[in-house]
């Protein structure tokens, strides 16, 4: 009785269970009752990452420097190349097909989480008592200067974009 289903790492063809090709190899010819499945290793710059019956291997991803990409991990016959972005840039997608500059946090906002190779900068509004007067991809919100600790008084209140301005205390005459 011919099989209707096959074991793991096998496939059904012509009423027969044939072995799948192992990762890193492609199918040359299906098995018969006299010969096993014939597989061949993927060529240079090619890969297959699963047990398969593919007749062609996949090309390794190209990390295009013109798109700000560089190789993070070189591909093998069983794995694809992993691309990442140059310093100061991050991937636009999980597949990392292109890069964009890290977004700076504008004045009034500070860096809550710095950008990584795969994620953009996360900015937060500077809360009361904090300010940021620069556009930066790494500067956090700074606390207003404490005039009291310097024996000074606030002459101009701070905002989310500016520090307080301290001045000397008025002396009693």
């Amino acid at each position: 009785e011919p099989p209707t289903a096959c074991r793991e790492k096998q496939y059904l063809i012509n009423s027969q269970c044939c072995s799948l090709c192992q990762p890193g190899q492609k199918l040359v010819s299906d098995c018969t009752e006299f010969t096993e499945t014939e597989c061949l290793p993927c060529g240079e710059s090619e890969f297959l990452d699963t047990w398969n019956r593919e007749t062609h291997c996949h090309q390794h991803k190209y990390c295009d420097p013109n798109l700000g990409l560089r190789v993070q991990q070189k591909g093998t016959s069983e794995t694809d190349t992993i691309c990442t972005c140059e310093e100061g840039w991050h991937c636009t997608s999980e597949a990392c097909e292109s890069c964009v500059l890290h977004t700076p946090c504008i004045p009034g906002f500070g860096v809550m989480e710095m950008a990584t190779e795969t994620t953009d900068t996360v900015c937060e509004p500077c809360p009361v008592g904090f300010f940021s007067n620069v556009s930066s991809a790494f500067e956090k919100c700074h606390p207003w200067t404490s005039c009291e600790t310097k024996d000074l008084v606030v002459q101009q209140a701070g905002t989310n974009k500016t520090d307080v301005v301290c001045g000397p205390q008025d002396r009693l005459r």
């Epitope: 011919p2 012509n14 009423s15 018969t32 009752e33 006299f34 010969t35 096993e36 014939e38």
Partner: antibody
Framework: EVQLLESGGGLVQPGGSLRLSCAAS????????MSWVRQAPGKGLEWVSG????????SYADSVKGRFTISRDNSKNTLYLQMNSLRAEDTAVYYC??????????WGQGTLVTVSS | DIQMTQSPSSLSASVGDHVTITCRAS??????LNWYQQKPGKAPKLLIY???SLQSGVPSRFSGSGSGTDFTLTISSLQPEDFATYYC?????????FGQGTKLEIK
């Protein structure tokens, strides 16, 4: 007990034909692929042809392709090899063998085919 | 077709000897290799299948190893009944092909 018994060999002239038979017993014949393997006098083994259990798949060595035909009659538990356009180099002992998972686990005693004028 | 080359072609040994026969494939065949024994005037007999699996009823002094292109049949302690011709056979690519044989003779 598994048994394979070949018959039909003999002396034939070049260009002639011969039909070999292999009678099988002791197993469910239709469940197994079968093959013919030959051995020229004083030489090694050569796989000639194979056939699937249901006759749906046949395969031949390049040296016999187009001249030999393998077939089976599951109702008679018999394997056949029709040999046409025979050449001197086809002279050999012909064995039938049972296939089980890519290996030939049972063989017949062989039948001698001599092609000579 | 895949070419199978056995070495040596012939070998003289004594009872009790440890004997190794090698078989090389012209391209990788994974572990898709069988070994057969044939005595004069008799049909071949399966010894080892899938490179290293011992066929039922075959004495444990016979063993097989190897994968890819290089394979070995080992007889750990030769017995008088082991003097015969040994053939390897690949099934990694159609058609199946045999090695030319290794004749094991008494020294």
């Amino acid at each position: 007990e598994v048994q394979l018994l070949e018959s039909g060999g003999g002396l034939v002239q070049p260009g002639g034909s011969l039909r070999l038979s292999c009678a099988a017993s002791g197993f469910t014949f239709s469940s197994y692929a079968m093959s013919w393997v030959r051995q020229a006098p004083g030489k090694g083994l050569e796989w000639v042809s194979g056939i699937g259990g249901s006759s749906s798949y046949t395969s031949y060595a390049d040296s016999v392709k187009g001249r030999f035909t393998i077939s089976r009659d599951n109702s008679k538990n018999t394997l056949y090899l029709q040999m046409n356009s025979l050449r001197a180099e086809d002279t050999a002992v012909y064995y039938c063998a049972r296939y089980y998972s890519y290996h030939m686990d049972y063989w017949g005693q062989g039948t001698l085919v001599t092609v000579s004028s | 077709d895949i070419q199978m080359t056995q070495s040596p072609s012939s070998l003289s040994a004594s009872v009790g000897d440890h004997v190794t026969i090698t078989c090389r494939a012209s391209q990788s065949i994974s572990s898709y290799l069988n070994w057969y024994q044939q005595k004069p005037g008799k049909a071949p007999k399966l010894l080892i299948y899938a490179a290293s699996s011992l066929q039922s009823g075959v004495p444990s002094r016979f063993s097989g190893s190897g994968s890819g292109t290089d394979f070995t049949l080992t007889i750990s302690s030769l017995q008088p009944e082991d003097f015969a011709t040994y053939y390897c056979q690949q099934y990694g690519s159609a058609p199946p092909t045999f090695g030319q044989g290794t004749k094991l003779e008494i020294k």
